[in-house]
Each structure stands twice: as structure tokens, then as C-alpha cells.
Amino acid sequence: GSGIFQLRLQEFVNQRGMLANGQSCEPGCRTFFRICLKHFQATFSEGPCTFGNVSTPVLGTNSFVVRDKNSGSGRNPLQLPFNFTWPGTFSLNIQAWHTPGDDLRPETSPGNSLISQIIIQGSLAVGKIWRTDEQNDTLTRLSYSYRVICSDNYYGESCSRLCKKRDDHFGHYECQPDGSLSCLPGWTGKYCDQPICLSGCHEQNGYCSKPDECICRPGWQGRLCNECIPHNGCRHGTCSIPWQCACDEGWGGLFCDQDLNYCTHHSPCKNGSTCSNSGPKGYTCTCLPGYTGEHCELGLSKCASNPCRNGGSCKDQENSYHCLCPPGYYGQHCEHSTLTCADSPCFNGGSCRERNQGSSYACECPPNFTGSNCEKKVDRCTSNPCANGGQCQNRGPSRTCRCRPGFTGTHCELHISDCARSPCAHGGTCHDLENGPVCTCPAGFSGRRCEVRITHDACASGPCFNGATCYTGLSPNNFVCNCPYGFVGSRCEFPVGLPPSFPWVA
């Protein structure tokens, strides 16, 4: 602890100029004071001034008022500093002396004589308020006041608490009257050394070095550091933890940059045609009647559907067509005949049957021919009977469907599961795709069927084809091929045609 006992001398009265021994001072009592401060004693005794002592210069002669003086000799109030915890009790001895010698340092003069002394014993709490008192004896009177205050930076009832305001990285605070810390705005903690971060800053993913700040830890972003940063290069994907790249619907590949749903994202097929996805950026448009072109953007001639019968010739008109009928036929589509069986109207061996009492006829066509006059050869593929991309082929009187891999049945309507025979080795996961099964291999294996064990730097052998980029370290003991546009497969070995709905991990 550290404090100061302060004694303010106010007035001393010695009207007769007498000493304690009854003698008078000639020409008057040139008065100075000795003060002794010590621990509390019920009976004041001689001995060391344990709390301190001080002497004044000559302050006046006989009777005088003592003025306050803040510096130099004759300082008033008198200061008795101490470097211990103030006990709350004390004994004080104030002696008035006459000196015939030096005004400034009377202590050192020989022949000094005691005028009077007073002794005060009691309790005194630390505080700013002065305690005033007056002591009389038969010859003199002394008016004075005193108090105990703490030294700078010391606080509390006994001046025992040290506190120094500071504003650096070991604390940002001021001191309360009791010596406790009062944090500056924006700071917290026992020593006010912890900044209060921006409100809402994520506790784990963000921090701050000064108030109202939110600095993100690696892998996090956003004003409050509550948004993860996806894998570098992630195009159409999101993350729930840092460096993830979970693809949005319709996107695939390591960086979610392969468009698996070109139809939905770009709507390339026009005029009400049907769009079918066929791998990254791949699609086909199935046109409605009357349209053609890669995107069904071209309108067909109104005559394209061959509406004119019986050999009539078709002429396009605005929003319509017109049939020019051959001799013997009439009607909008030349469907009415003026011919009879006598005119031999049936071609390709068709049999003529008279109708309406010979005023018209009907042809019964042999196999593979059709039309009102058996003039058309039958095309059994016009109805698009083959499903799942199967190719229709005319075979004489019948037709057959040539199915794409993975499909079977008369109309290619049945899907074959290539994964049923478990083609993937070493615990690889099988995926049924249009062009056959594809295996996703566990760590440490590669190959189309996961049959190759990896024992070295997976990318060293250059396993990726068609200019693909090889990555290792994305998971233990494996590599990943990031395919260029137009190729898929674990090594980017397949041209577009099957959608990679999962990352290709070899």
C-alpha cells in the first residue's frame, strides 16, 4: 500500500510568548514544529516515529496564522508518506519549539526550547475530508486539521490496491474508486484485454483483435464468418464445411462445372419440341410434326406430310396447301375418284373391288404396299416404334429394333442392369449408365473395374486421357481426373454420352 498522512497547521496562539518551562522567549518565541506519526499506542511513548516524522521551518513568532503553501520550505499541509497498508489507527505528536537560530533549518540549531506539545490517538479512515481539531493548554492553543489519502494509483480503504489505467495489449481500462478495473468501451475480461467482436461474429469461425471486428479463420467468409468457402474453382456447387463442392442439381464433376441438365438450364429446343439430356452439355431435340433442324427451329413445308392422295401434287400456300389432282380424282386431298375398276387403278398387284354400283372402287393391297391405289410401299418405322434411342430397321415384310447398350425387348423397352453381375472389384461401387456399367473405386484402387491396385503417386503414370487434369491428395491414395468438355469417365476416356452424376474417383 501507499498513502500520505496530511497535517494542515492553521493557527498557533502563544500570547505571552512563554516556553513550557515557564520562561519567556526574548524578544518572542520564534516557533517551528516537530511532528511524529506512529502506530496506535494507548499511552504515547518515546521511541521511533514508525509512520514517519517531519519538521517545519520557523512559521511565526508567538501567535500566528499558518498559510497553505504547496512548495518549498514551510510547505503546508505537511506530508507524511507511507508505503504500507494504512491500519486505520494512529498516534500523532505535534511539538511547538522555539529556536534562537536559523529560520529555515531550526532542527539543527543548539538551544532549542519546547513551547508545548499535543498528542492525538485514535482511528482515521482514508478519505478526502479533513478532520479539524483544536488543542489548548494553559499557555497555548493550536488549530489544525488532518486526513489520510492514497498515493496516486493506490485505492481502497487501506490504500492497498494498486491500479494504473492503461490502454495497451495487456489491458484497456480505467480505475474505479475502489481500485477495481473499469473496462474501456469494446473490451472485456478480467484484465479488459479481450476485445468484444462484432455482434453475431461466429464464436469458432471468427475472432477479433480490436472491438467491433470479425476476422474469419481459414475456410470461412462473410461479415460474421458464418459462410464456408467452397473448393477453389467450384462453379455450380455449395459447401456446408470449408473446401467442399457439393454440386447443385443438374451439375457434375469435381468442380461442378459439367452441365448435366442442359435442357433445363438453356432450353435449346424450340417450337414445343422435347429436349433430352445426353451427358455434359449434350442434348437431343425431338421435333413436333411440321418442324425440323437440330433445335426444331426450322418449319417444314405444309406439304411435308404428303396430304394429297392418289398421286395428287401438293403446292404450299400461306398457312395451308393445295392439292392438284391427277385425271380421275377430285376433292381437297384428291380423295374422291371418278375412276372405276375398268380403268385398272390399283398398282403393285392390288385387287380392285367395285363400290356404289360401279361408280367407285377400293383397292385391296398386297403385303408391303398401301395407299388408296396401293401406290406406296409400307415403311414400318414411321411410327417410331423403338424406345430408348433404338434404331428401327425395315426387314422385308417386318421391321426390327436395334437397341442401344443396356436395353432389350422387341421395342428396346426393357432396361438391362449391368450391375446385377457385380462387375466392380475391391468393393467398388457400380453405377448403371446408358453406355454400360461404371465403377467408383475405393481409395487405393483404379481401373474401369477397380482391378488395379495403386502403390505410388497416382498421377505419376499420367492416368488421365484426352487432356484431362490429374489431382491427388483429395482423398488418400487416389487420383481424380477433371475432364475437359466432351469427355467423361474415371480417366476421361469416354466421349460425351453418359452423364457423370458422381465424381470420378479412380
Partner: antibody, heavy 121, light 106 residues
Framework: EVQLQESGPGLVKPSETLSLTCTVS??????????WGWIRQPPGKGLEWIGD???????YYNPSLKSRVTISVDTSKNQFSLKLSSVTAADTAVYYC?????????????WGQGTLVTVSS | SYELTQPPSVSVSPGQTASITCSGE??????VSWYQQKPGQSPVLVIY???TRPSGIPERFSGSNSGDTATLTISGTQPMDEADYYC?????????FGSGTKVTVL
């Protein structure tokens, strides 16, 4: 009890970068109660504070060295490091790492044993 | 920049009191630490926050700080106390060491 151990090359060529690492054992460098400092002492001379850092990476440097000093922390390894660039013979000193306690008003209650770094060609 | 000044040396007889001063502008308003360093050894903290002794430091070491001067006092000095002593304070965000005082026990 916490122990600090400096490591790094004892000889550095002029104009190069001095790099030292302090490994903390027996306590976590991630405590908010401490800053981790570097102090140096040229042969036969007094102590000079270089700078310090806390677990979050907040750094404070001696203004006279600030342009050349970088202090960093690696909480996963319980280490902090000093880099001093463009060194000259005047940077020859024993380099100490120390723990500065917030509760002690910034007093350094634990020190490494020090490592002598000589700058010479 | 802020500076702390110490006397280069102080001599004391065994059993006597050694006082080492450390002066700096407004030093009384800053917390002062004192370090003891023996030859070939790392510094050891003997006083922090002006007058507090860390555990393990003998009671003969005490400190005070007011005005522009901080003082480290070694009462009943022993031969083992012969060492260099450094005061240290924080000026804003910067640590500042005194120039050091060599204490010789005669």
C-alpha cells in the same frame, strides 16, 4: 511448468533473413492469458524487446525494428516464430523467447535459454 | 522513443541494502517489472507491477514506483544476488527495457 526452447541457425549472412522458432511445452500456446515475445541481447549489452504475438495472431513490434520483423504463431505445433530480414552485424545477439503474462501486467515469467545468432559472411 | 535510465553499477556489502533506480518520464503511471540476469543465464522476473514478487522470489527483494522513478531494493544483500538487473515498462504497445545495472556484492 511451461518450458520454452529456441531453435534456428546460429549463423546468418548479411542481407539475409534470420529465422527462429520457439517451441512451447508444458502448456498451451492457445491460452488467452499470455503473449509470446522475442527479446534479444547483443554480446555484453542490455536487453532489447523485439515484439510479441498472441494465439490469435495479433502482433506488436518494436518501432525501431518494425519494418524488418515478422512474428507468427502455429497453434497446431505449439510454436511461434521470428523472422528478421536484411540483417547486419548489428543484429548479432542472443535471441530469447519469453512468455508475457497478462495477469502480471505484461511481466515475462518464463524465458527460453536463448540462442546466439551471429551475422557474418 | 521512450527511455528508461539506470545507473551502470551499484556496489553493496553483504547484509547491507542495495537500491537500484530506474527513471523515465511519468514512470510512476506505468507498471514496472524487474529482471535479474546472472552471467550466461536467461533473465528471471523478480518484481512485477511495481512491487509484487512472483512465487519463489525471496522477500529481500522489494520494489516501489512513484513520480518519475522506480526503485528495486535488495535488503540484506547476499553474494548470490550479484547479477545484472533490468527494469522494464510498457509504453503504449511497446516493451522498453532499462539500460541495466550491475550489482556487485563486495
Amino acid at each position: 511448468e511451461v518450458q520454452l526452447q529456441e531453435s534456428g541457425p546460429g549463423l546468418v549472412k548479411p542481407s539475409e533473413t534470420l529465422s527462429l522458432t520457439c517451441t512451447v511445452s508444458g502448456g498451451s500456446i492457445s491460452s488467452s492469458n499470455y503473449y509470446w515475445g522475442w527479446i534479444r541481447q547483443p554480446p555484453g549489452k542490455g536487453l532489447e524487446w523485439i515484439g510479441d504475438i498472441n494465439y490469435n495472431g495479433n502482433t506488436y513490434y518494436n518501432p525501431s525494428l518494425k519494418s524488418r520483423v515478422t512474428i507468427s504463431v502455429d497453434t497446431s505445433k505449439n510454436q511461434f516464430s521470428l523472422k528478421l530480414s536484411s540483417v547486419t552485424a548489428a543484429d548479432t545477439a542472443v535471441y530469447y523467447c519469453a512468455r508475457e503474462a497478462v495477469a502480471l501486467g505484461g511481466g515475462a515469467d518464463d524465458w527460453g535459454q536463448g540462442t546466439l545468432v551471429t551475422v557474418s559472411s | 522513443s521512450y527511455e528508461l535510465t539506470q545507473p551502470p553499477s551499484v556496489s553493496v556489502s553483504p547484509g547491507q541494502t542495495a537500491s537500484i533506480t530506474c527513471s523515465g518520464e511519468g514512470l510512476g503511471d506505468k507498471y514496472v517489472s524487474w529482471y535479474q540476469q546472472k552471467p550466461g543465464q536467461s533473465p528471471v522476473l523478480v518484481i512485477y507491477e511495481d512491487s509484487t514478487r512472483p512465487s519463489g522470489i525471496p522477500e529481500r527483494f522489494s520494489g516501489s514506483n512513484s513520480g518519475d522513478t522506480a526503485t528495486l531494493t535488495i535488503s540484506g544483500t547476499q553474494p548470490m544476488d550479484e547479477a545484472d538487473y533490468y527494469c522494464q515498462a510498457w509504453d503504449s504497445e511497446t516493451g522498453v527495457f532499462g539500460s541495466g545495472t550491475k550489482v556487485t556484492v563486495l
